[in-house]
Interface confidence: medium
Amino acid sequence: ECVTKVFKDISFQGGDLSTVFTPSATYCRLVCTHHPRCLLFTFMAESSSDDPTKWFACILKDSVTEILPMVNMTGAISGYSFKQCPQQLSTCSKDVYVNLDMKGMNYNSSVVKNARECQERCTDDAHCQFFTYATGYFPSVDHRKMCLLKYTRTGTPTTITKLNGVVSGFSLKSCGLSNLACIRDIFPNTVLADLNIDSVVAPDAFVCRRICTHHPTCLFFTFFSQAWPKESQRHLCLLKTSESGLPSTRITKSHALSGFSLQHCRHSVPVFCHPSFYNDTDFLGEELDIVDVKGQETCQKTCTNNARCQFFTYYPSHRLCNERNRRGRCYLKLSSNGSPTRILHGRGGISGYSLRLCKMDNVCTTKINPR
Amino acid sequence: ECVTKVFKDISFQGGDLSTVFTPSATYCRLVCTHHPRCLLFTFMAESSSDDPTKWFACILKDSVTEILPMVNMTGAISGYSFKQCPQQLSTCSKDVYVNLDMKGMNYNSSVVKNARECQERCTDDAHCQFFTYATGYFPSVDHRKMCLLKYTRTGTPTTITKLNGVVSGFSLKSCGLSNLACIRDIFPNTVLADLNIDSVVAPDAFVCRRICTHHPTCLFFTFFSQAWPKESQRHLCLLKTSESGLPSTRITKSHALSGFSLQHCRHSVPVFCHPSFYNDTDFLGEELDIVDVKGQETCQKTCTNNARCQFFTYYPSHRLCNERNRRGRCYLKLSSNGSPTRILHGRGGISGYSLRLCKMDNVCTTKINPR
């Protein structure tokens, strides 16, 4: 059920997945919606507690039943992820936040005219996730007009504090406004030897690229295909970064593919959702439910309609013993990161992903021709 | 259960695995945490006994129940390993110990300005594990400013004595501060013919390399793969060293792989923990428990959550018709050195390691680009 209403002075009890810091309840809901498992959130508004270090905390929550008990809490704002909702969702957040300092790794500072120009700098820098700009009213004269570009491991600030004379905001890459080069090539027989920031399991290089695009710090990736010689690394998608933003070393290796995040692109293809079916493929993960349905499309629909389902494996009916009505068995699954824990072949399954992320693809997806 | 508290004037009774010498209770706990089986320790502080040769003894202990009886002992400090704890653990120890002489094989001496420079020399020498530096206050004028580089078979001093005018400490290689060449290549079809200091069983060359990296004196290794002609040597990981620090002879042999310890590297990959699953592979060892679980991920999690479990083999349930809950059987295992005693194939098991050592990977693992 889709619940768009937020509940003021209410906290959801239990179900904590993690805590991040966001400048508003709206942005907290956006983070929850994009998180692989978050279904509910509680946001601690400014002055919600005597301890300012707890202000702006966005507590991401999950529940097997998709609901949690509500308790009264002054200054808390609680609500539900938009995973359960049909509407188109944008990952783009153009809001700026006055008198808020969003803390992160300050890796670049420069003097610019205004906050808009600072946001543009952030949008046009490969590493930048958010920024803080010291306005002409900032108390320290030496720091006025200073634009700080920032990133964190998670893509959200490590903390947020009140600070007069500053304006903060997020990169507009996901609004399709980056002028950085969009590199769509996928390079066959290529391993990129830079820093692995994360690794996930993926069925193909296109899913790996989408995961990289959706990841806060991934700039490029290497994917090891099913034919990769080292069995334990098959289907491994290595999410990578480097200081320069470009890979430093390219190694030629068969059965590996590499490419770049599409975060700078005006998307002509889906970058969040993975619509394909993968034949003779089992996605392993945490089993959520097993239902009998007719056909893999229905299985995918069932997964999409279940807010906690991330991916599925469907076994067509001929695999069942005393098969009656040509229904197959649909295994609904999830994992901590939204990706299968393992991918197996030769067991007769047909696997795929929930389509609930499709509605997060930016509006350009259906408007811009591929180059 | 994680217990961070230490117990003063208390000794744990029984469960002894081995005794090493460490300059502090903190370092004793570090050694216990890294030891494959140690769960508890008792450290004999200075003046803990009338016999100075017993001072600084660090007694590593194990217990099937994970607890041991406590007895009063003046000067003893007892506590628990951090294996049971969730926090990130560093193998890096920057402390220096004033007026303590840490004994070992003195293989190099030179005159340097201060203790920091001596520690840097140690960090930038392949063999050096710890050092003793004679300060300007050392009684013997001839030996002042002398920096002694040391190693032992275990990586810890053979004994520790009180000695005025000296400062001792450990190499900072595990802090990612070594300037020595980091050699990441793994060489196929290669046997290195130098001194074997130890041998363990490993599923692949990457695990072999991690074990070498974690070993106090291993500088390089040779691994015999599953296809190695001599059956008794298959999956054998030979840990090696040489006087020069580099291999002297390289022999071309099919189905063998060789490489180097990553102790000098600023790690971009885990070097302590072995996260992969090994399909159609049985790890043999001492059985700790057998539990029915859903999936190899749960089996690995069960192993990780058991402080004594080092590795496991999981046998999936077959896709039977009237199968109810798709549980497989999870065998939790351990051995004296943390590695399987044998590795077998073709029996349908899925094997892997406890992930508890992952938290020992140094912080650089996720932060520093590979050199």
Partner: nanobody
Framework: QVQLQESGGGSVQAGGSLRLSCAAS????????VGWFRQAPGKKREGVAT????????YYADSVKGRFTISQDNAKNTLYLEMNSLKPEDTAMYYC?????????????????WGQGTQVTVSS
Amino acid sequence: QVQLQESGGGSVQAGGSLRLSCAASGYTFSNNFVGWFRQAPGKKREGVATIYTLGSSTYYADSVKGRFTISQDNAKNTLYLEMNSLKPEDTAMYYCAAARGWVSPLDPARFVYWGQGTQVTVSS
């Protein structure tokens, strides 16, 4: 020391063609952004075409799309600009430039190494 040396400029009638070359030393084209920029008298330096040399990603200014083609020869460590259907407004000093890191492809501010330039003059 990085050195970029342009050649191939000259005078040509409108509608004609030229091929510019840029030879690099002290810098490898194998995995970087390299490009062509131009500056007409009294005007700002502007991006013409850029290539990401690991693959086939190319970026062109709207004014040259369909007429100019950028390419590279990694073996020779050389960058090229094939210019067809030249127009008088293409008259400018043409510079080869190389970057260090990710760039806005036609933004000269992001390029750190520059050649001395080669003059292209197109008469009507």
